[in-house]
Amino acid sequence: GSERTCCPVNWVEHERSCYWFSRSGKAWADADNYCRLEDAHLVVVTSWEEQKFVQHHIGPVNTWMGLHDQNGPWKWVDGTDYETGFKNWRPEQPDDWYGHGLGGGEDCAHFTDDGRWNDDVCQRPYRWVCETELDKASQEPPLL
């Protein structure tokens, strides 16, 4: 396929990536599923600059990102290394809290009202952000 050279309609370009900000809520997996059908994935935050950009667009609203520990260690959905990468957890997070009474712990990460990260129950219907890289091959022809 050809490489995408600009973002789709209703997506926002920033630093060679395209972002789409939902205005409704879905469970974490359903949110990533939505992104996958748009040739994207839940947002992967790799820098303080990207954190500020996303935070500016979502406002003080709980919003899913592409980070989870459903199989043990924390992983980004695009394979970006978690251990060596950017992190912005709230103090004492992640805590895998079991006290919510919903069964299990907390395996999915979201932006909180102040932008810092928290782990929460993956079934909660939060807003989400999709991201796709501009330089990767795309099924769409470039828009000239």
């Epitope: 997996a29 359903d30 990533d32 599923n33 939505y34 996958r36 059908l37 748009e38 040739d39 994207a40 199989n71 959905v77 695009d78 394979g79 990767k136 091959a137 099924q139």
Partner: antibody
Framework: QVQLVESGGGVVQPGRSLRLSCAAS????????MHWVRQAPGKGLEWVAV????????KCADSVKGRCTISRDNSKNTLYLQMNSLRAEDTAVYYC?????????????WGQGTTVTVSS | DIQMTQSPSSVSASVGDRVTITCRAS??????LAWYQQKPGKAPKLLIY???SLQSGVPSRFSGSGSGTDFTLTISSLQPEDFATYYC?????????FGPGTKVDIK
């Protein structure tokens, strides 16, 4: 038990339309994304279409784009595939399949398939 | 679209043999790859998802590895019921393309 049963296949003339149905049972249908996958005689698997659990997003493969409509009725636990302007190359066994709750984890339940033959 | 290739296209093996099938994606797909087994006249069956996770109920002689663009399915000791065709599928983005298949038959 978890089951998917396709129907609606048969012999159809080129240029005509066909609607396939898939009846789901044994699981909470509205919690899962669903796929259609087809297999031409003696050939490999070809992914055709997908729809999210709530119908909020759906996509068809390029080979059927513009001729394909995937839909679902969660109140009836039924998945549909409408195929228009059928061609000889659409002849295949069409499988209805359940995606795992996170679609990247693949397709874990398959129907037995329904055969579509496009011929004059 | 992401293209998937598999090799070999067919392999002849005996019961007890170790069989390795490779799958390559035309661009990086992280670990989002599934493997299926299909027998003649039957629907496919999911064996491995997320490149290396064994689907519930699948024997442990099946294993998967790889990430990025190169992936492997290994059958550690081939059993009579394993003679079938094996397909990889990328689940990273639509269209969720399949590889062309690898037929494992009796030597």
């Amino acid at each position: 038990q978890v089951q998917l049963v396709e129907s609606g296949g048969g012999v159809v003339q080129p240029g005509r339309s066909l609607r396939l149905s898939c009846a789901a049972s044994g699981f909470t249908f509205s919690s899962f994304g669903m796929h259609w996958v087809r297999q031409a005689p003696g050939k490999g698997l070809e992914w055709v279409a997908v729809i999210l659990n709530d119908g909020s997003n759906k996509k068809c493969a390029d080979s059927v784009k513009g001729r394909c409509t995937i839909s679902r009725d969660n109140s009836k636990n039924t998945l549909y595939l409408q195929m228009n302007s059928l061609r000889a190359e659409d002849t295949a066994v069409y499988y209805c399949a359940r995606g795992q709750q996170w679609l990247v984890n693949g397709v874990d339940v398959w129907g037995q398939g329904t055969t579509v033959t496009v011929s004059s | 679209d992401i293209q998937m290739t598999q090799s070999p296209s067919s392999v002849s093996a005996s019961v007890g043999d170790r069989v390795t099938i490779t799958c390559r994606a035309s661009q990086g797909i992280s670990s989002w790859l599934a493997w299926y087994q299909q027998k003649p006249g039957k629907a496919p069956k999911l064996l491995i998802y997320a490149a290396s996770s064994l689907q519930s109920g699948v024997p442990s002689r099946f294993s998967g590895s790889g990430s990025g663009t190169d992936f492997t399915l290994t059958i550690s000791s081939l059993q009579p019921e394993d003679f079938a065709t094996y397909y990889c599928q990328q689940t990273n983005s639509v269209p969720f393309t399949f590889g062309p298949g690898t037929k494992v038959d009796i030597k």
